[in-house]
């Protein structure tokens, strides 16, 4: 497979943000790639959001993804959104060069994202 | 040395504050056993917070330690407080048998303790 | 009153084979890891064997000078501990002492390796 | 393996002298750390345990001082019964290696 590195441990932000790099070797000149993120709890994996993108172009995820991302060569700058304390996982990035032919897949050893809820604020009187 | 088991991974909570067993196999019947927590970061070893107790009784940490602890058999229950983004580290658990001879000595693998400081509560009008 | 009688030592030759023991008194002997240390002449102290108790499975630790020639053990119901010394060496020559975890010294017993 | 450097290997001083000997482990032994004193047909005997601990009937001329890699023996006033030689020695874990001594004698 090909190789695909990603950071062991991220802490989300105390707004439930949480930002990674997935790097991968590319065996060659791709065009068109396409990455996605999985979660790994209690071993059941679930996709978290996934985009395609032409080397040069900004990623693009649906509107209601929780992802949003950049890329600059081989490297995909992932950010995820809205997470809560239910949300600590391992989190794959898998990577796809969709074009030209041959078809290459790398997956990472996943990035173990931790989150913490934040205590509420006391009301304003 | 002695065998000392303490969590891989342990989440502060936004207030700051994190808890974590640490639990030792005494080799024989200790009366006095003194519980030391140290932070190693950068390979820097720092003590956090030292406790001396008599089995069956209760843990006491010095006034102004950041430290608090019960003991039940071979279990110490550790918990930090006061702690910052900043303080994110390793936390290693030291479990000396003073008395009676022989003294043993046992460290623990540490307990990575992730702290993220909280967004600020919005000012009350 | 805590005491370590070790017994067994005496004159051997090269490639031969020796045990010593080591009578404990005093103490709750099972509640203890147990130790050989020898000194050679005119040399320092060596830490040579290590035999932990029934908490920790009587786990054998040894040092590189002596391990695969000379084994541990202990009898609990007897409060004794054992170093069998086997292909003895000239320079396994000392005064050998048994001792529970550093605490408590035997008076040595004198091993000599000599043709 | 843990390496332990004891200094000096040997030292003279007079009755009443502040006396230092020094440990250098060869990496961090979180104090597991002993110190005896061993008499010429005499048994080795405990002296500091844990680095800094007195052991039972030892007198409080004796202190253990010192974490991480380095640690010092201190005889506050020596006498003349201190005469012996002395070995630190790692308790952390195997092989419990030993210093190679410290030979002390009145001037």
């Known amino acids: 497979a090909m190789h695909v590195a990603q950071p062991a441990v991220v802490l989300a932000s105390s707004r439930g943000i949480a930002s990674f790099v997935c790097e991968y070797a590319s065996p060659g000149k791709a065009t068109e790639v396409r990455v996605t993120v999985l979660r790994q709890a209690d071993s059941q994996v679930t996709e978290v959001c996934a985009a395609t993108y032409m080397m040069g172009n900004e990623l693009t995820f649906l509107d209601d993804s929780i992802c949003t991302g950049t890329s600059s060569g081989n490297q995909v700058n992932l950010t995820i959104q809205g997470l809560r304390a239910m949300d600590t996982g391992l989190y794959i990035c898998k990577v796809e060069l969709m074009y030209p032919p041959p078809y290459y897949l790398g997956i990472g050893n996943g990035t173990q994202i931790y989150v913490i809820d934040p205590e509420p604020c006391p009301d304003s009187d | 040395a002695m065998h000392v088991a303490q969590p891989a991974v342990v989440l502060a909570s936004s207030r700051g504050i994190a808890s974590f067993v640490c639990e030792y196999a005494s080799p024989g019947k200790a009366t006095e056993v003194r519980v030391t927590v140290l932070r190693q970061a950068d390979s820097q070893v720092t003590e956090v917070c030292a406790a001396t107790y008599m089995m069956g009784n209760e843990l006491t940490f010095l006034d102004d330690s950041i430290c608090t602890g019960t003991s039940s058999g071979n279990q110490v229950n550790l918990t930090i407080q006061g702690l910052r983004a900043m303080d994110t580290g390793l936390y290693i658990c030291k479990v000396e048998l003073m008395y009676p001879p022989p003294y043993y000595l046992g460290i623990g693998n540490g307990t990575q303790i992730y702290v993220i400081d909280p967004e600020p509560c919005p000012d009350s009008d | 009153e805590v005491q370590l009688v070790e017994s067994g030592g005496g004159l051997v030759q090269p490639g031969g084979s020796m045990r010593l023991s080591c009578a404990a008194s005093g103490f709750t002997f099972s509640d203890n890891w147990m130790n050989w240390v020898r000194q050679a002449p005119g040399k320092g102290l060596e830490w040579l064997a290590q035999?932990?108790?029934?908490?920790?499975?009587?786990?054998?630790y040894y040092s590189a000078s002596v391990k695969g020639r000379f084994t541990i053990s202990r009898d609990d119901s007897k409060n004794s501990v054992y170093l069998q010394m086997n292909s003895l060496k000239t320079e396994d020559t000392g005064v050998y002492y048994c001792?529970?975890?550093?605490?408590?010294w035997g008076q040595g017993t004198l091993v000599t390796v000599s043709s | 393996d843990i390496q332990m450097t004891q200094s000096p290997s040997s030292l003279s001083a007079s009755v009443g002298d502040r006396v230092t000997i020094t440990c250098r482990t060869s990496e961090n032994i979180y104090g597991g750390l002993n110190w005896y004193q061993r008499k010429p047909g005499k048994s080795p005997k405990l002296l500091i345990y844990?680095?800094?601990n007195l052991a039972s009937g030892v007198s409080s001329r004796f202190s253990g001082s010192g974490s991480g890699t380095d640690y010092t023996l201190t005889i506050s006033s020596l006498q003349p019964e201190d005469v012996a030689t002395y070995y630190c020695?790692?308790?952390?874990?195997?092989?419990?290696?030993f210093g190679s001594g410290t030979k002390l004698e009145i001037k």
């Open positions: 001792t529970a975890q550093f605490a408590y």
């Open positions: 035999i932990r108790n029934k908490p920790y499975n009587y786990e054998t």
């Open positions: 020695q790692n308790v952390l874990r195997s092989p419990f290696t």
């Open positions: 844990g680095a800094t």
